[in-house]
């Protein structure tokens, strides 16, 4: 007839697929059986494995990152209980909508995490790489996504997201984008035979550059650009009477936003 | 030697109550878990509730068939388990056994005990 | 509560020949399976557990294979002491169930 065991917990670790448990058994020999199970797994025994005289041990690879695992050693009808759970996952892939962007809106989207998952936490950081906005949304099968609102146009951002399971939180996994800067304002035209003054207001937000185009049915005629604190722009050698596609773009961030207006020379 | 003996089964009108008694020897009864199964003439396994150690406060598990008419207990002093049957019901005529079951060495391990019948008829 | 369907319901083999059972759970159990052997007039009598581990005296002639909801209890080579009524029962949740049962016969 096996006695009953006296057992302690030596050491319990846990990454995204793997557990470890070691524990010691207390005074003569004895018979236990390790047992653990999940909410979906059902029970099964843990190989264990002698570490020496007193201390037993179990490693189990291949698990459900984010998942909660019980684990039993048993003796007879004694037992302790150790509750261990598997970090989670960040999503594979996380990105920025780029067709979605606005002046003053990012959206991000992301894949589901492989294991449980609770919730996600998405935050926006500056260029800076101070905190903006963060945001916990819950998971969902169907609804893997975020709009961020009231953004700075023109700017660089980076968005972290990290999956939460229980009270475990895995590593970030960061993308970045960029709000599309502002067009300009107030496009004003001074006109001359020769010559066009162009003169305009800034938008909102950020402009690293304005660039100045005068087009002629498609084709770049005549171009410039200027820094972020100019506001006028004068085109010289013009043909006079004749009609031209102005188009004032403003660049930041890597993408752009322009206003277009047609003009016409002054005639002789 | 592992024994279960069971005793008490016997002919009881439906809406009466019997109670089973097991005598367990031959193992560290207060260390282990133990269970009623029972099986009706000719049919198969019924698995009918269970009952654990006192370090486990004595905690019990039913079968939803018997939920709420059974009660098991147990008196580790005299090494012995209970089956209490009230409102007793003709689909309770049955063989009712007596069953520990332990976990050690990686096993899980039931011992049976022959099995007192018992007959619910009017 | 878990549901154990064992299949077939009966099953006749010559002597000398394979006879396998299988048990099917209606949710995961992990491995937390248990065979047994009955015959007439008699308690039954464990024969596997942990899905695949024989009990001390079990010949080897059985086996048992099988995890999560899938168990199958093999005889390899069928003698005549085996004809009995086996039954799967899982003990991974309460309430612990038995599947309702396989009579095994000699063709």
């Known amino acids: 007839e096996p006695e009953r065991c006296n057992f302690t917990l030596a050491e319990s670790k846990a990454s995204s697929h793997s557990v470890s448990i070691q524990w010691r058994i207390l005074g003569s020999p004895c018979n236990f059986s390790l047992i653990y199970s999940s909410d979906t797994l059902g029970a099964a025994l843990c190989p264990t494995f002698r570490i020496d005289n007193t201390t037993y041990g179990c490693n189990l690879q291949d698990l459900q990152a984010g998942t909660i695992y019980n684990f039993r050693i048993i003796s007879l009808d004694e037992e302790r209980t150790v509750v261990l759970q598997t970090d989670p996952l960040p999503p594979a892939r996380f990105g920025v909508s780029k067709e979605k962007t606005t002046s003053t809106s990012l959206h991000v989207w992301w894949t589901p995490s492989s294991g449980k998952v609770t919730s996600y936490e998405v935050q926006l950081f500056d260029e800076n790489n101070q905190k903006i906005q963060g945001v916990q949304i819950q998971e969902s099968t169907s609804w893997n996504e975020y709009t961020f609102f009231n953004l700075t146009a023109g700017s660089k951002y980076n968005i972290a997201i990290t999956a939460v399971s229980g009270g475990k939180r895995s590593f970030s996994v960061y993308t970045n984008g960029s709000t599309v800067p502002s067009p300009v304002k107030d496009i004003g035209i001074s006109t001359k035979a020769n010559s066009l003054l162009i003169s305009w207001s800034h938008g909102s937000g950020n402009v690293e550059r304005y660039r100045l185009m005068l087009m002629d049915k498609g084709i770049l005629v005549h171009g410039g650009v200027v820094d972020k604190h100019a506001t006028s722009y004068a085109f010289h050698g013009l043909t006079p009477g004749y009609l031209y596609n102005l188009t004032v773009m403003t660049e930041a961030a890597g993408l752009q936003n322009y206003r277009w207006k047609l003009v016409r020379t002054a005639p002789m | 030697e592992v024994q279960l003996v069971e005793s008490g089964g016997g002919l009881v009108q439906p809406g009466g109550s019997l109670r089973l008694s097991c005598a367990a020897s031959?193992?560290?009864?207060?260390?282990?878990?133990m269970n009623w199964v029972r099986q009706a003439p000719g049919k198969g396994l019924e698995w009918v509730g269970r009952?654990?150690?006192?370090?486990?406060?004595?905690?019990?598990y039913y079968a939803g068939s018997v939920k709420d008419r059974f009660t098991i207990s147990r008196d580790d002093s005299k090494n012995s388990l209970y089956l209490q049957m009230n409102s007793l019901k003709t689909e309770d005529t049955a063989v009712y056994y007596c069953?520990?079951?332990?976990?050690?060495?990686?096993?899980?391990?039931?011992?049976w005990g022959q099995g007192t019948l018992v007959t619910v008829s009017s | 509560d878990i549901v154990m369907t064992q299949s077939p319901d009966s099953l006749a083999v010559s002597l000398g020949e394979r006879a396998t059972i299988n048990c099917k759970a209606s949710?995961?159990?992990?491995?937390?399976v248990a065979w047994y052997q009955q015959k007439p007039g008699q308690p039954p009598k464990l024969l596997i557990y942990w899905a695949s581990t024989r009990h001390t005296g079990v010949p080897d002639r059985f086996s048992g294979s099988g995890s999560g909801t899938d168990f199958t209890l093999t005889i390899s080579s069928l003698q005549a002491e085996d004809v009995a009524v086996y039954y799967c029962q899982q003990y991974s949740s309460y309430p612990f169930t038995f599947g309702q049962g396989t009579k095994l016969e000699i063709k």
């Open positions: 031959g193992f560290t009864f207060n260390a282990n878990a």
């Open positions: 069953v520990r079951d332990y976990y050690g060495s990686s096993a899980w391990i039931t011992y």
């Open positions: 949710q995961h159990v992990g491995t937390a």
């Open positions: 009952i654990r150690t006192k370090s486990n406060n004595y905690a019990t």
